[in-house]
């Protein structure tokens, strides 16, 4: 005999919630695998600038995406299937996974906050290396793509410590179209924008993390309530 009333509502709520979660995981995993195997993006992600490889943050980034996507699909499946099948075992595993993920999120949040300066430094170093390579080797399309991505995403251009040649090449070729080279280079340069992202905009990342954490706690409560509901319904 299945669950009834409010517990039935929780069952379908948990199902829908986790189905969306499973789909999102699938999209992330798909994009990550595509990035990993597509020749153009592989060049971009494993960019070797001269004799300097891209910082470890970026090298590992793709695998983190793959792992996140896979875990999301797995946990989403557990929640989805566990709810629809009214399986205490699957829901218990789902709850355990959520507890582990919650702990990981807290740990990642603390690590990110503690190492934010190092991460920002890595990002700036990567930008500088890409910019240098784009100027020195004008055939380095992957380096140019990295530089243009930075410029368009952060709406910036160059940094305040540029060589004459780099300034000239940026002005004519790599700055976002219609941008003012003077203001871009000396007022809101990319180094400044990267620093802003990791300090001034840190609260946005914090808000996102809190939202995810609240959703996790909400799912933990729902899964426990449903688990108890299943246990109770099987008694009667």
């Amino acid at each position: 005999m299945g669950v009834e009333g409010c517990t039935k509502c929780i069952k379908y709520l948990l199902f829908v919630f986790n189905f969306v979660f499973w789909l999102a995981g699938g999209v992330i995993l798909g994009v990550a695998l595509w990035l990993r195997h597509d020749p153009q993006t592989t060049n971009l992600l494993y960019l070797e600038l001269g004799d300097k490889p891209a910082p470890n943050t970026f090298y590992v980034g793709i695998y983190i995406l793959i792992a996140v996507g896979a875990v999301m699909m797995f946990v989403g499946f557990l929640g989805c299937y566990g709810a629809i099948q009214e399986s205490q075992c699957l829901l218990g595993t789902f709850f355990t996974c959520l507890v582990i993920l919650f702990a990981c999120e807290v740990a990642a949040g603390i690590w990110g906050f503690v190492n934010k300066d190092q991460i920002a430094k890595d990002v700036k170093q990567f930008y500088d290396q890409a910019l240098q390579q784009a100027v020195v080797d004008d055939d380095a399309n992957n380096a140019k793509a990295v530089v243009k991505t930075f410029h368009e995403t952060l709406d910036c251009c160059g940094s305040s410590t540029l060589s004459a040649l780099t300034t000239s090449v940026l002005k004519n070729n790599l700055c976002p179209s219609g941008s003012n080279i003077i203001s871009n280079l000396f007022k809101e340069d990319c180094h400044q924008k990267i620093d802003d992202l990791f300090s001034g905009k840190l609260y946005l990342i914090g808000i996102a993390a809190i939202v995810v954490a609240v959703i996790m706690i909400f799912e933990m409560i729902l899964s426990m309530v449903l688990c108890c509901g299943i246990r109770n319904s099987s008694v009667y």
């Epitope: 100027v135 020195v136 080797d137 004008d138 055939d139 305040s160 410590t161 060589s163 004459a164 040649l165 300034t167 000239s168 090449v169 002005k171 004519n172 070729n173 080279i181 003077i182 280079l185 000396f186």
Partner: antibody
């Protein structure tokens, strides 16, 4: 030893055209930015144009923009400057120079070729 | 009128120390762009003398030295020799004009 040898200069009428060449040797030409710098009689040096190693990036001084075109042939280790719609004020000794990314300057120069624009 | 201002001429006797100044603005030397110095004997190829404000390429005697302060730079030649008689040009990059800029040149005469 780095060597840059300019040629193609001479006397030309206003409105005329001229093509300067610069033969390079003693270094990996295809890996270096190259530039043209000129010096009008009794005046100082004036940067004219540069070209990147694979010809992707070029830039010009405002005084020659739209009239001069810089190009290169890496297989021949040669730099060119095509000069059209020449004016009297373009009269100068034109120097070919290698641009060093590391030093961020013109580290080697040729001896120059004289271009005289006169009717 | 050059963007970078240099004295038209300078002179000194052998063994003396001579300084040539190069005055720019906040859009070139003052903007943080390096100043470089070239030696030019008429009819020959200009030669890089000082790069990055104060560095000497290999082969340039240590009698030549460069410095930079604010919007100005200077070239000092100590123990002046007759072969130092030439035109000297300073060079930088101007971010407002987006061009490489040179000084008007200083003609150095070694007297006696």
């Amino acid at each position: 030893e780095v060597q840059l040898l300019e040629s193609g200069g001479g006397l030309v009428q206003p409105g005329g055209s001229l093509r300067l060449s610069c033969a390079a040797s003693g270094f990996t030409f295809s890996s270096n930015y190259m530039s043209w710098v000129r010096q009008a009689p009794g005046k100082g040096l004036e940067w004219v144009s540069y070209i990147s190693s694979s010809s992707t990036y070029t830039d010009y001084a405002d005084s020659v923009k739209g009239r001069f075109t810089i190009s290169r042939d890496n297989s021949k280790n040669t730099l060119y400057l095509q000069m059209n719609s020449l004016r009297a004020e373009d009269t100068a000794v034109y120097y070919c120079a290698r641009y060093s990314y590391d030093r961020d300057n013109f580290d080697y120069w040729g001896q120059g070729t004289l271009v005289t624009v006169s009717s | 009128q050059s963007v970078l201002t240099q004295p038209f001429s300078a002179s000194g006797t052998p063994g003396q120390r001579v300084t040539i100044s190069c005055t720019g603005s906040t859009s070139n030397i003052g903007a943080g762009y390096d100043t470089h110095w070239y030696q030019h004997l008429p009819g020959t190829a200009p030669k890089l003398l000082i790069y990055g404000n104060s560095n000497r390429p290999s082969g340039v005697p240590d009698r030549f030295s460069g410095s930079k302060s604010g919007t100005s730079a200077s070239l000092a030649i100590s123990g002046l020799r007759s072969e130092d008689e030439a035109d000297y040009y300073c060079q930088s990059y101007d971010t407002n004009l987006s061009v490489w800029v040179f000084g008007g040149g200083t003609k150095l005469t070694v007297l006696g």
